[in-house]
Structures are given as structure tokens and as C-alpha cells.
Amino acid sequence: LSLKGSQTLTVCPGSVQPLSSQTLRASSSAGTDPQLLLYRVVRGPQLGRLFHAQQDSTGEALVNFTQAEVYAGNILYEHEMPPEPFWEAHDTLELQLSSPPARDVAATLAVAVSFEAACPQHPSHLWKNKGLWVPEGQRARITVAALDASNLLASVPSPQRSEHDVLFQVTQFPSRGQLLVSEEPLHAGQPHFLQSQLAAGQLVYAHGGGGTQQDGFHFRAHLQGPAGASVAGPQTSEAFAITVRDVNERPPQPQASVPLRLTRGSRAPISRAQLSVVDPDSAPGEIEYEVQRAPHNGFLSLVGGGLGPVTRFTQADVDSGRLAFVANGSSVAGIFQLSMSDGASPPLPMSLAVDILPSAIEVQLRAPLEVPQALGRSSLSQQQLRVVSDREEPEAAYRLIQGPQYGHLLVGGRPTSAFSQFQIDQGEVVFAFTNFSSSHDHFRVLALARGVNASAVVNVTVRALLHVWAGGPWPQGATLRLDPTVLDAGELANRTGSVPRFRLLEGPRHGRVVRVPRARTEPGGSQLVEQFTQQDLEDGRLGLEVGRPEGRAPGPAGDSLTLELWAQGVPPAVASLDFATEPYNAARPYSVALLSVPEAARTEAGKPESSTPTGEPGPMASSPEPAVAKGGVDEQLYFQGGSGLNDIFEAQKIEWHEARAHHHHHH
């Protein structure tokens, strides 16, 4: 990796400057794509901030950027004006350039902020040169709020500063009035005043009357040393504008402004809704606006006024629809800081907000909503609903356009059909099953973000409260006991106070689930089972005949059972038991109780002891207590009216206050 470019950036005070390839240019001997040349900001700027043009400029400090983003002019340094005047200030950024597998390269970017620089957006080299407004025929004090050369003084080291001053030499006098210092008029023989006199409020402009034409004066300002000696240092030649206003003038009244909304890269006219004033004694053409600060998301343009940005326009331009905003590629909202004047009153600050709307939004559904079976309810999160456009949309709003079939959406415990992303992020939006006839549900929402909408379907599934443990591989050709060591809904039984039921939905592909006789004396062989209960598991009444995969050589295989589990007062859930199988190995200890082993293995062994007798299950894996009446926890059940009772039972909590009575087990 190598780093070229000057590694220096010159910035005008209070302005934004993009980093460019002249400033920072990384390359690699491998000709790496600029997208893969990554800069990390090790230490950010002290006098301003670094941000990305396409991202929210008010957010976090920029931590990473690429060479490609530098080339695109998207990495910006913004100098923040300090409260104290300065002439030149220096800032540094410490960066680390990386592009594996090459070794990282450290870089320092030096930033010079100087009033010396030629700044189009800041034509004065002084700390302040704002001009003056004066009523016709009257006088006004020129203070440091309007004209201030303190920054020239700031170039002198602070110990010597008190011995220095700034000399203003008037090179062209006002034509419609007079400048006075301590009540003495300035003239060709005495064309000077000092920064110290300005700071003391001793400089006055007196208008001579006879009209409201513009006035002003030109000057040269430079440092003056002790005893009035001229010293080397910064200097500038500028003009100071004086606006004369009619004393009878009524100032214009700005009206409330509606933000302009448009999509990225588009153009929209600015109307009176965005910019208008009430001024009974001025024509629209006399009301002038000037852009003081423009946002980064686009510019203003006038129809017929060329392609470039405009910084001055009138109310007439707005009223006639000639003024438009042209959005660039940025997705960030911005504000124009404007000043508005009717030419006779002091300028009034105004602002125009520009919201960039996404051209499209997408509802991201990362995962279905999983509802724990025993609870029957779950909060939605960003995993289910999150809106993105060219960025995340934290202020998205949602409206239910197709409700769930088996439950309700609740906010604050009440059914709702509208909610916000904020409520989702706070965990306040809850889906609750109210009809327990399905293990899944779905609902459709319409998401709205910054004027754009999109719809999405949220799927809801129930997570079974079932402990499943297959252990190691199971022997093909054997019958093994299905009991709570393999499948256990005991916790669901405790939580619901009922005997959970299972229904076999699918599988096994090779084999079958059977009910086994309790003892040798019990008549009949094993019966095929499609439905069973937790009690059957606890009683050891179930077996799984593990088949051999047909049409292939003997060897390990995989199989599974898919079951639906349901219990009282909770939604059903689908669960699966995945297990591996292998040809029976008499020498291997299996982790499950075998009720029978393959016929061939028995014949080979020739001993009845080599298998567990088919008729008699081994010792019980769990207590013969039934799977109910083990707790005293309050139930919270949801019911929903089926036929016309929705309003009565609308997502109502039914609290069950009962210490469950123990039941005796009957065989």
C-alpha cells in the first residue's frame, strides 16, 4: 500500500470542504479496487468534524471510509466556527489505511483553516463584515457586530497582542453620508480609524438624507504595531455596505413555512407554502431573499437562470413558480438559512426545510414471529418489522391491512390496527393467540415512511414447549421405547394443568410409531399410532419401530418425526424429532431403551438375554405421576369468540386462580 496526495487540506472558516484525490490518494501494487482501500479514523478532527455527504450529517462521527468515497467527493470536513476570533488554525486527522493482506499504513491529514484563503462563500477576510442598515436621514453606530477585524489581531502572539491594533484606512468614502470617529468626521486628510475605536463604539455613520439609495465605503485593514508602527502581517481590502431604509416602511412579516418534500435526484418547485411574506407596501419583486447557508442535499435554481445554483431571488420568482429545488443524490434532510428583506428594512432570517423522500421503501422481515407455546403471546421486534429505504427509517408507521386469523395485535393490552416503529422497538406491540386451533398465523401490514408506503406479511409460528433428545444413532430394525427421555412435554403439562396431546403429522420415512402391549399377558401385537399423549409417554406405552432404508446398501441414515403438540389454553405447535439410524450393533450401548432388536441379531446371538423382551418395557424413565397438578402458578388464558363473540372475548385475559389439585393415576 502507498499513500500519495498532499495530505493537506485548506478550509475556509466555517465551511465544508470535500477531501479529494489531490489530498488523499491511496493505491496498492495489486491495483486494488478503491472500494477495498479502507481508511479508519484513529483520531478525529478537533476543530470540526468529518462526515459522509450521503449520510445523516448530524449523527455519529465518521469512523470508516473508502478511497472510492474520497474520489466521489463524499467525505467532507466541516470547520466549526469557534467563539474566539483567529486568523489561522491547524487541525489534524490520524488515519489508518488498510487493504488486507497488505500491511496497514498510518497517515496524518493536516487541515489548515485560514482567513487568508480565497473563499467564495465567505468573501470577507475579516471576522465580521456584515454591513449596516440605517434609517433615511439618521445615524447609526457601526459596532463589532457589523465590522470586526479581531482575527487580524489574533495572528499576533497573545503576549504582544495588547500592544497591537488594526488600522482601517478608508480608500473610498461614503457618497450619501459621513463617517465619524468620536464625533469627528473622517476625510481625505484623516482617513483612518482603529479596531479599538470600533470596539469602543466610537464609529458612526450619519446619513445625509435625500433618498434611500445604497451607500458604503471601501477600506484597507492591516496590523499596526506599538506606537503606530506598520508591521508585517495579514491585511485585506474590502467594502462595507450601508443600506438606507425608508423611515415610514413597515417591515415584511414572514409566514409559516411548510417543508419541501421531494425524492432523491428530483426537482420540485418552491411555492408560497414554503416561502412567503406579508408586506402591504412592497411588491413581490421588491422582496429579496439571499441564501446564507445551503444544505448538502441540493441547490436552488431559477427557470431560465442557467443550470447552476442561485443565491439571490425574489418573492416574484417564488410566486411565478420559477424557483425550484434540485435534489442531488443525498438522502439527508437539510435546511436553507435565508435572509429576507424588502430593501428598506433590516434583513430577517428565514429558513426553508427540505425533506428528501425515499423513492421506495422496503419492509425487512428477517424472521417470523416466534410465540412461546406456554405464553401464547410475543412482542414484535426489528427482526419482524423494520423499514429501510436508502437508510433505516426509525419513524415508520404501520397499519394493519389484513388482521391475523387466530389472534390479535395488542398495544398496551388493547387490540390495535395501527402502531409505530418506535412502539415495536420498545417491545410494546404484542401478538397474542386468542384462538387455539392453529400453530401458525399471519397478518399483513402497510408501512408508511416519509410519504412512501410498502406492504409486507408477518408470519407467526408457535415454538413448542417440548424437550426433544434423540441421543446417538438408533439401531435399524429395532423397536425402541418412546418415553420422556426422548420426548417430554411435562413442562407444558405443568404450565397448562392439562395432559398435552401429540399428533403425528409426518414420518418416520423408514419405520412407524406403535402402541406396545403393557405385558406379555396383554393380547395383540403392537398397533400403529397417529395420536398419543404425554401420559402415554410417561406410561412407556409407545414404541418406534426403526426401519431400514430400502434400495440401498446398509449404513447410517437420517429420519425424523414431525408432531403437532397441543394442550389446554395455549396454541398448538409443530415440532420435529430428528434422529440418525445405523445398522444394529450388539456391542454398542444405545442411549434409548430397546423393546426389541432385529430378528437377525437375535438369531446370531442365539441367547434370549441378548435383547430386551418385547412385551415388558424396562424401568420407567420418569415418575409415574401424571403430567398435571404439579404447580400453583396463575394461568393467563386468551379466548376469542368464534361466532359473533369477538367483541365480547376480544383478547381478554382470564386469570385462573387455583392451586392445582393432585390427581391420582389410573391404569
Epitope: S437, P572, H663
Partner: nanobody, 116 residues
Framework: EVQLVESGGGLVQPGGSLRLSCAAS????????IGWVRRAPGKGTELVAS????????RYADSVKGRFTISCDTSKNTAYLQMNSLRAEDTAVYYC?????????WGQGTTVTVSS
Amino acid sequence: EVQLVESGGGLVQPGGSLRLSCAASSFNIKDTYIGWVRRAPGKGTELVASIDCIYGYTRYADSVKGRFTISCDTSKNTAYLQMNSLRAEDTAVYYCAAQGYRLHYWGQGTTVTVSS
């Protein structure tokens, strides 16, 4: 199409008895959980009793324990709620609910009024 129909409600004096029936059609109650739920005017909903129709396991709300008995008769495909020693506070509309494999039905309700 009617799934559950309750009957047996009516006006009874305090201390009296009633037997509510819940007849199921188009599904078998043998493998369901049956619950009796009541809603009194201006009050919330209360699950008073429930039964597992395979095993006969029952549960009761404290307010009715020892006075109400829930049962299933799978041959008649009907569940019952025997209510003894009735009190004024038992006045409500009583609904029967059945929950089973991929089903969850409610009846239309039957009104029980306990008043002297």
C-alpha cells in the same frame, strides 16, 4: 355447521341448582379440553371450570370450588356443568368452549340468573 350449543340456563333462587349442557356437533369431544366460561354484566370474563375429556382431569376457579362439577359424556358427545348452592354472584352468561386438534369453538351462551 353449529359446533357447540349450550342449554339448561334459567332463573333459579339462591341455594338452588342447575345443570348446563354443551352439545357438540361435527366433531368428537372425546379428545378435547372443554371449558365453561362466564361473563357477568359489567365484569370481566372468568374461566370457571375445565376438563380433559380423555383423562377426566378437572380444574375449578376458587369461587366455584366444591359447588360446581364439570363432566364429559363422550357417548352423547356432550359436556355438563352441574351447579349447586347457587349464589347471586353466579348470575352471568355461561359459554362453553372446546379446544382440540386444530379446533377451538365457542357456543352462543346460556343465561343463568340467581335471584330471590
